[in-house]
Interface confidence: low
């Protein structure tokens, strides 16, 4: 039996700058039961704290709730792996919440074929921002991207929607069934996952003629 291998903190993400979660990969366990603890201190402080919540983020994770999350202070964190033979430590990881935001996917994706009498027909796509994000304060700017493709096609067609929460698409293949998804990202941070796909049948008489 050996002391445990070196763990690695490989990812930290925040859904909204108010909370965040970090995940680590355990090293080898040295053939013995191994306990993991995450400790951290804030920039300029020497007092160490233990992870406030090992449950919410799933296995090998640490979740920082609202009361533990500060925008203005860098977190310096480390994972300690301990078994009967000894302890091993991850490299220290420096986390600034501003740069790890990954929102939840947009909600309430609605897709509709519009065929006005006097204009070209189009596909109208509408969605809502994720609930955890409060856009009214101006604290967040969310950007959106739409992707769609005929059901049996391999390639996605991608449209950047900017900050708007609805979008029109004119060029579509009549008679095809399309999959539509939307995702979002903050001005600094990561794209969300794609929303669940919404399906829409394009009528056979959908025409692009003037």
């Amino acid at each position: 039996q050996l002391p445990p291998g070196k763990p690695e903190i490989f990812k930290c993400r925040s859904p909204n700058k108010e909370t965040f979660t970090c995940w680590w990969r355990p090293g080898t366990d040295g053939g013995l039961p191994t306990n993991y603890s995450l400790t951290y201190h804030r920039e300029g402080e020497t007092l160490m704290h233990e992870c406030p919540d090992y449950i919410t983020g799933g296995p090998n994770s640490c979740h920082f709730g609202k009361q533990y999350t500060s925008m203005w202070r860098t977190y310096i964190m480390m994972v300690n792996a301990t078994n009967q033979m000894g302890s091993s430590f991850s490299d220290e990881l420096y986390v600034d919440v501003t740069y790890i935001v990954q929102p939840d996917p947009p909600l309430e994706l609605a897709v509709e074929v519009k065929q006005p009498e006097d204009r070209k027909p189009y596909l109208w796509i509408k969605w809502s921002p994720p609930t955890l994000i409060d856009l009214k304060t101006g604290w967040f700017t969310l950007l959106y991207e739409i992707r769609l493709k005929p059901e049996k096609a391999a390639e996605w067609e991608i449209h950047f929607a900017g900050q708007q929460t609805e979008f029109k698409i004119l060029s579509l293949h009549p008679g095809q069934k399309y999959l539509v998804q939307v995702r979002c990202k903050p001005d600094h941070g990561y794209w969300s996952a794609w929303s669940p796909a919404t399906f829409i049948q394009i009528p056979s008489d959908f025409t692009m003629n003037d």
């Epitope: 700058k17 920039e43 300029g44 020497t46 925008m71 203005w72 860098t74 220290e92 101006g138 604290w139």
Partner: antibody, heavy 118, light 110 residues
């Protein structure tokens, strides 16, 4: 006594360079984030740059980004500010300040300042 | 132009109470701690209030800070001649990733 002492200021031509130093004493320098703040003659305070205790996190004001470089030598208890491509608008008294450990983001100790004239 | 807005001047007579305001936005005062600094003529700034309303040791309890929404204020009661100075508010700005200061308020004791 906790003290910060800046040096390296002086008169420099536009486009020139200067390196400011800030010698710290009376506290464990390597445990604290450090900052540079400047004050143009007759004007208010302007934050310039910050560096974390281990130099892993560094921030700059947009007005100096790409021209100024903050660094520190924890073994010498010294903070530096390398200023390149200096402009007339960089003329100011430059203060170094300590990031307050328990004091919620405050700059709790300030040096006496060093004057840079471009 | 400063990100945080302060009145350029304020005045009062000895013994009076004076308040200095500091207005910001959701990305600085609205979501982070406010700090106040005092700068006496010809000297370096000195920390006066941190964490919205906390006084470092050595600062008289005549000085108090408060914060509401995206604004903050510094109150000085029992004004004294030695309080004549420039006062600056400051906060971390999460959108700019840096500290922002108010333009400063020159306090005159009449």
């Amino acid at each position: 006594e906790v003290q910060l002492l800046e040096s390296g200021g002086g008169l420099v031509q536009p486009g020139g360079s200067l390196r400011l130093s800030c010698a710290a004493s009376g506290f464990t320098f390597s445990s604290y984030a450090m900052h540079w703040v400047r004050q143009a003659p007759g004007k208010g305070l302007e934050w310039v740059s910050s560096i974390s205790s281990s130099s892993s996190s560094i921030y700059y004001a947009d007005s100096v980004k790409g021209r100024f470089t903050i660094s520190r030598d924890n073994s010498k208890n010294t903070l530096y500010l390398q200023m390149n491509s200096l402009r007339a608008e960089d003329t100011a008294v430059y203060y170094c300040a300590r990031g307050g450990g328990q004091q919620l983001g405050a700059f709790d100790i300030w040096g006496q300042g060093t004057l840079v004239t471009v | 132009q400063s990100v945080l807005t302060q009145p350029p001047s304020a005045s009062g007579t000895p013994g009076q109470r004076v308040t200095i305001s500091c207005s910001g936005s959701s990305s600085n005062i609205g979501s982070n701690f406010v700090t106040w600094y005092q700068q006496l003529p010809g000297t370096a700034p000195k920390l006066l209030i941190y964490g919205n309303n906390n006084r470092p040791s050595g600062v008289p309890d005549r000085f108090s800070g408060s914060k509401s929404g995206t604004s903050a204020s510094l109150a000085i009661s029992g004004l004294r001649s030695e309080d004549e100075a420039d006062y600056y508010c400051a906060a971390w700005d999460g959108s700019l990733s840096g500290w922002v200061f108010g333009g400063g308020t020159k306090l005159t004791v009449l």
